[in-house]
């Protein structure tokens, strides 16, 4: 009669994380009496899935009666697969005795789990940066099986092709990570951009996954300063603007100063927003120019986002101003921006 | 008790070649051999390793480059298509009785050079 | 893969002195303890020194002594002899079902 063997007839088997597995054994022969174990590997190391003799395997059914005394069907379902599965999987009758020795292992079947990536993590810069300048922003995936998997990125649509990714473990795992970083470089108008981490994988079935990024949360847009003066008002006051243009974030304090003297600060409460996200202000002095017998130096101080002020300077000369009422002899503007 | 290995010879790249190791002196309820590899100069590479019952496991890099099969009196190694980083001396090792996958006994080793 | 990190790849020191080789393994070892140490000179087959991580093989001096668990291993050779010198090798068993080597460290003495 010919020697038994144990045959597994599918070398591999892929099945989904959350789903079951089933793995194929027949024997050729009831001889040997003796029963068949299942393990997850042929070394020392191996971990018994199940045997037919003893224990308890809450996860492990067979998939035909192997108790009946003519079955020579051996296969079982393993369910709830987990990347932690993977693994190649061994059929092996042992032959009756005290104890039972090893008589013959099938081929092995390789289970390889598919493992959804979870949801891509985008993160950027700590600080924000200013527009000109190229800012890092990492996208983490984890969690996924096989190893093979796409990433792109895009800024409002448009492709980056400034990034780097890397696939870890290298070798074989039960389940691997990504993470990747690219480089964006920033402009004024990029207060509504976002910028988006598209991952594919072969469990997602051609729905990529993505994670974004709004590009408001790391771009500071300074604010230009323009300080203009209004015509001379009644009982000789005039009246002097600081316009506040295109910002962001909105956080700015604004000073002005007399002759170098803090005179008022206030902070930007009502804005308008402008069509790229930036906002405008503008704050107003009042001057009353027979109160100063020389000329005044006025100047509007802005600190935006906790950044150093930048200023920009109206020269009020008072010798121009006549002091009788209704004058309206324009004061020289001789602006400057200071830092 | 002992393992030892033949079979090494020089061989042309793409030439298939087969070691054997031959196991003598025990009588063992269980017990697997092990495949390893050293080039010259270099340290220990482990290939893969098979049970008594015939179940055979493979490093990652090794799996689809060798074969460890078992015969009634050997554990023979397939060498699918040897190329020249595949020179190196060839060890068979045994392990036995303990549960902790230490490679008991070793044979002295065949060397392999694969060169045009 | 599983890595196993061995340093330093070089150590010397004076007869009857102690030699400290580390071995540290990128994940743990099946059961914390599946690490073994091999000693190979030039030309030999490797042999069995420490399995388990620190249970001496037959026939081999206590002076070897293995400690360590999970990912952290060490190998000690005190009261060092000329006969000593060689190279050391640990060896990892894991779950996955693969049994790989550290890089060796070889020891001089002197």
């Known amino acids: 009669e010919e020697e038994l063997q144990v045959i597994q007839p599918d070398k591999s088997v892929s099945v989904a994380a959350g789903e079951s597995a089933i793995l194929h054994c027949t024997v050729t022969s009831l001889i040997p009496v003796g029963p068949i174990q299942w393990f997850r590997g042929a070394g020392p190391a191996r971990e018994l899935i199940y045997n037919q003799k003893e224990g308890h395997f809450p996860r492990v059914t067979t998939v035909s009666e192997s108790t009946k005394r003519e079955n020579m069907d051996f296969s079982i379902s393993i369910s709830n697969i987990t990347p932690a599965d993977a693994g190649t999987y061994y059929c092996v009758k042992f032959r009756k005795g005290s104890p039972d020795t090893e008589f013959k292992s099938g081929a092995g079947t390789e289970l390889s789990v598919r493992a959804k990536p979870s949801a891509p993590v985008v993160s950027g810069p700590a600080a924000r940066a200013t527009p000109q300048h190229t800012v890092s922003f990492t996208c983490e995936s984890h969690g996924f099986s096989p190893r093979d998997i796409t990433l792109k990125w895009f800024k409002n649509g448009n492709e980056l092709s400034d990034f780097q990714t890397n696939v870890d473990p290298v070798g074989e795992s039960v389940s691997y990570s990504i993470h990747s970083t690219a480089k964006v470089v920033l402009t004024r108008e990029d207060v509504h951009s976002q910028v988006i981490c598209e991952v594919a994988h072969v469990t997602l079935q051609g729905d990529p996954l993505r994670g974004t990024a709004n590009l408001s949360e790391t771009i500071r847009v300074p604010p230009t300063l323009e300080v203009t003066q209004q015509p001379v008002r009644a009982e000789n006051q005039v009246n002097v603007t600081c316009q506040v243009r295109k910002f962001y974030p909105q956080r700015l304090q604004l000073t002005w100063l007399e002759n170098g003297n803090v005179s008022r600060t206030e902070t930007a409460s009502t804005v308008t927003e402008n069509k790229d996200g930036t906002y405008n202000w503008m704050s107003w002095l009042l001057v009353n120019v027979s109160a100063h017998r020389d000329d005044v130096k006025l100047t509007c101080q802005v600190e935006h986002d906790g950044q150093p002020a930048v200023s920009k300077s109206h020269d009020l000369k008072v010798s121009a101003h006549p002091k009788e009422q209704g004058s309206n002899t324009a004061a020289e503007n001789t602006g400057s921006n200071e830092r | 008790q002992s393992v030892e290995e033949s079979g090494g010879r020089l061989v042309t790249p793409g030439t298939p070649l087969t070691l054997a190791c031959t196991v003598s002196g025990f009588s063992l309820i269980s017990y697997y051999i092990s495949w390893v590899r050293q080039a010259p100069e270099k340290g220990l590479e482990y290939i893969g390793i098979i049970n008594i019952g015939g179940g055979a496991s493979y490093a990652s890099w090794a799996k689809g480059r060798f074969t460890i099969s078992k015969t009634s009196t050997t554990v023979d190694l397939k060498i699918t298509s040897p190329t020249p980083e595949d020179t190196a001396t060839y060890f068979c090792a045994m392990s036995y009785g303990m549960d902790t996958g230490a490679f008991n006994i070793w044979g002295p080793g065949t060397l392999v050079t694969v060169s045009l | 893969a599983q890595v196993l990190t061995q340093t330093p790849a070089s150590v010397s020191a004076a007869v009857g002195g102690t030699v400290t080789i580390s071995c540290q393994s990128s994940e743990s070892v099946y059961k914390n303890n599946f690490l073994s140490w091999y000693q190979q000179k030039p030309g030999k087959p490797p042999k069995l020194l420490i399995y388990?991580?620190?249970t001496l093989a037959s026939g081999v001096p206590s002076r070897f002594k293995g400690s360590g668990s999970g990912t952290q291993f060490t190998l000690t050779i005190s009261d060092l002899e000329s006969d000593d010198a060689a190279t050391y090798f640990c060896q990892g068993g894991y779950r996955t079902d693969i049994y790989p080597f550290g890089g060796g460290t070889e020891v001089v003495v002197k």
């Open positions: 388990g991580a620190s």
